[in-house]
Interface confidence: medium
């Protein structure tokens, strides 16, 4: 058992049936000795008495909020929480996989540019008793920190009969270089609690992998005298890191015509313009990836060719 | 300085083009070296990020653009500790924090030589000759030394001699190859600031 | 108060593209739910798309998946949200409307306080 903030403690399990359980001692907080009694929940059943309560945690009814009482009037409060652990392995019953970039990935993190500013975002199916808590470091050994704002929910969709919500957080370095040379990775750690059961979840990562660039700003097209051709000219996002000399971008462009199956023209430039056969019906799409160091590309930003 | 240039003049600042080079050399390195050695943790997740040239010379900090230089963040460890002219800077006018960040990139270039040159016979002695270092990425290394044209001495190739343990030396390789593509990474950052400077 | 401005309506024959842009300002921020839903003549205003606040994430009607793309510019603390149509069928004809939320992204009306005039898109040859 281990305290998750004041009064709230995690009960570690190992879930099987007929498993035996956890003994928990709970101590209420008074310089009272005698004439308590226990309560849990809502319930007015006693379920002992004294200072100190013994209980064998097993299942989530031996979960939830127990009180210590005197004479009618409440003591202290501590309420337990059940963290299922089933062949080893921690229950991920909360959030959702979203087996990108690869299996057993619940959390999601992208930066646009070097500033230490990350956002990292999580998908669930629970839609009510649930809060999640979200603490962040560099390196974990001799943590650097790294402040994390209130998790809130940032968008709610439907996916087939279900409803899917998708809960968002955005964290910075407290005193991040955008030049610096990363050794030790992020750590974002959340904390979720959906009724009486606790999970964690982790991810890992160096800023450099988890760059995703806004698309190119100010798209253009400037049609070249007696000529199919234009000039499509665009400017870094306002969001890159400066100055952009250092912080170079690479482009994609590409010609797309209205039909999916048509082929697509690609160019690649580490210029902000490129000439283009523009055809009919077709856009021109154009997107940014840092020049040097291959992570996400950005999506893309688009024009019609008319 | 919005507009990055794509091909440059060579004769303007020759140590962009070798930069890129350098670059691709150890990408393609590592690449290969993830794929030959899919057995070994080899993985940027895990492997243990070290940086063989810590506390030896201050690239990161010795070539900070000068927009940056108000990041106190940034400040944490400049050091000033040595000057010389190189000839990539052509007939530019040389400032002191130039010529120091070009020499500690030198400096950088000369460590790794000497590693990879180190690990390299230590490979070639492996009966499984499974990876061996690319001779490009030695040879771009040796290019970028001389465009730089720093005056050092030479330091002698190490050898040891001790039984090598394969495993333990195919592993450095993995450490060595992140930590240098990240290294070449801030290079070729450098040399593309200091062309459009 | 948020003002929401639409641009960028107007008549294309079908097959052709369309940008619609719709700029947010009144109050400075980017961490905004924003969307674009239309009304066809005849018919209630229904969902086409949004940008989730903060994660940006997106999400489309069945009906422009693939032929329609939302995107936003956070630039100096003001929020574009465009629209880029292509592909565009008869049956897109109608008055768009950009809304904005500093709540979450959902592809429900009501979550939304803030609604542009909207700009009418007429698909005709």
């Known amino acids: 058992i281990w305290e998750l903030k004041k009064d709230v403690y995690v009960v570690e399990l190992d879930w099987y049936p007929d498993a035996p359980g956890e003994m928990v001692v709970l101590t209420c907080d008074t310089p009272e000795e005698d004439g308590i009694t226990w309560t849990l929940d809502q319930s007015s059943e006693v379920l002992g008495s004294g200072k100190t309560l013994t209980i064998q945690v097993k299942e989530f009814g031996d979960a939830g909020q127990y009180t210590c009482h005197k004479g009618g009037e409440v003591l202290s409060h501590s309420l337990l929480l059940l963290h299922k652990k089933e062949d080893g392995i921690w229950s991920t019953d909360i959030l959702k996989d979203q087996k990108e970039p690869k299996n057993k990935t619940f959390l999601r993190c992208e930066a646009k540019n070097y500033s230490g500013r990350f956002t990292c975002w999580w998908l669930t199916t629970i839609s009510t008793d649930l809060t999640f808590s979200v603490k962040s470091s560099r390196g974990s050994s001799d943590p650097q920190g790294v402040t994390c704002g209130a998790a809130t929910l940032s968008a709610e969709r439907v996916r087939g009969d279900n409803k899917e919500y998708e809960y968002s957080v955005e964290c910075q370095e407290d005193s991040a270089c955008p030049a610096a040379e990363e050794s030790l990775p992020i750590e974002v750690m959340v904390d979720a609690v959906h009724k009486l059961k606790y999970e964690n979840y982790t991810s890992s990562f160096f800023i450099r992998d988890i760059i995703k660039p806004d698309p190119p700003k100010n798209l253009q097209l400037k049609p070249l005298k007696n000529s199919r051709q234009v000039e499509v000219s665009w400017e870094y996002p306002d969001t890159w890191s400066t100055p952009h000399s250092y912080f170079s971008l690479t482009f994609c462009v590409q010609v797309q015509g209205k039909s999916k199956r048509e082929k697509k023209d690609r160019v690649f430039t580490d210029k902000t313009s490129a000439t283009v056969i523009c055809r009919k019906n077709a856009s021109i799409s154009v997107r940014a990836q840092d020049r040097y160091y291959s992570s996400s590309w950005s999506e893309w930003a688009s024009v019609p060719c008319s | 300085r919005n507009l990055p240039v794509a091909t440059p003049d060579p004769g303007m600042f020759p140590c962009l083009h070798h930069s890129q080079n350098l670059l691709r050399a150890v990408s393609n390195m590592l690449q290969k070296a993830r794929q030959t050695l899919e057995f070994y943790p080899c993985t940027s997740e895990e492997i243990d990020h070290e940086d063989i040239t810590k506390d030896k010379t201050s690239t990161v900090e010795a070539c900070l653009p000068l927009e940056l230089t108000k990041n106190e963040s940034c400040l944490n460890s400049r050091e000033t500790s040595f000057i010389t002219n190189g000839s990539c800077l052509a007939s530019r006018k040389t400032s002191f924090m130039m010529a120091l960040c070009l020499s500690s990139i030198y400096e950088d270039l000369k460590m790794y030589q000497v590693e990879f040159k180190t690990m390299n016979a230590k490979l070639l002695m492996d009966p499984k000759r499974q990876i061996f270092l690319d001779q490009n990425m030695l040879a771009v290394i040796d290019e970028l030394m001389q465009a730089l044209n720093f005056n050092s001495e030479t330091v002698p190739q190490k050898s040891s001699l001790e039984e090598p343990d394969f495993y333990k030396t195919k592993i450095k390789l993995c450490i060595l190859l992140h930590a240098f593509r990240i290294r070449a990474v801030t290079i070729d950052r450098v040399m593309s600031y200091l062309n459009a400077s | 108060q948020v003002q929401l401005v639409e641009s960028g309506g107007g008549l294309v024959q079908p097959g052709g593209s369309l940008r619609l842009s719709c700029a947010a300002s009144?109050?400075?921020?980017?961490?905004?739910?924003m969307a674009w839903f239309r009304q066809r003549p005849g018919k209630e205003r229904e969902f086409v798309a949004f940008?989730?606040?903060?994660?940006?994430?997106?999400?489309?009607a069945d009906f422009v998946k693939g032929r329609f793309t939302i995107w936003r510019d956070n630039a100096n603390a003001k929020v574009t949200v465009y629209l880029q149509m292509n592909n565009l069928k008869p049956e897109d004809t109608g008055v768009y409307y950009c809304?904005?939320?500093?709540?979450?992204?959902?592809?429900?009306?009501?979550?939304?306080?803030?609604w542009g005039q909207g700009t009418q898109v007429t698909v005709s040859s």
């Open positions: 009144g109050r400075e921020f980017t961490s905004v739910s």
């Open positions: 809304a904005a939320s500093e709540g979450p992204a959902t592809i429900r009306q009501n979550t939304y306080p803030d």
């Open positions: 940008s989730a606040r903060i994660s940006e994430t997106t999400e489309y």
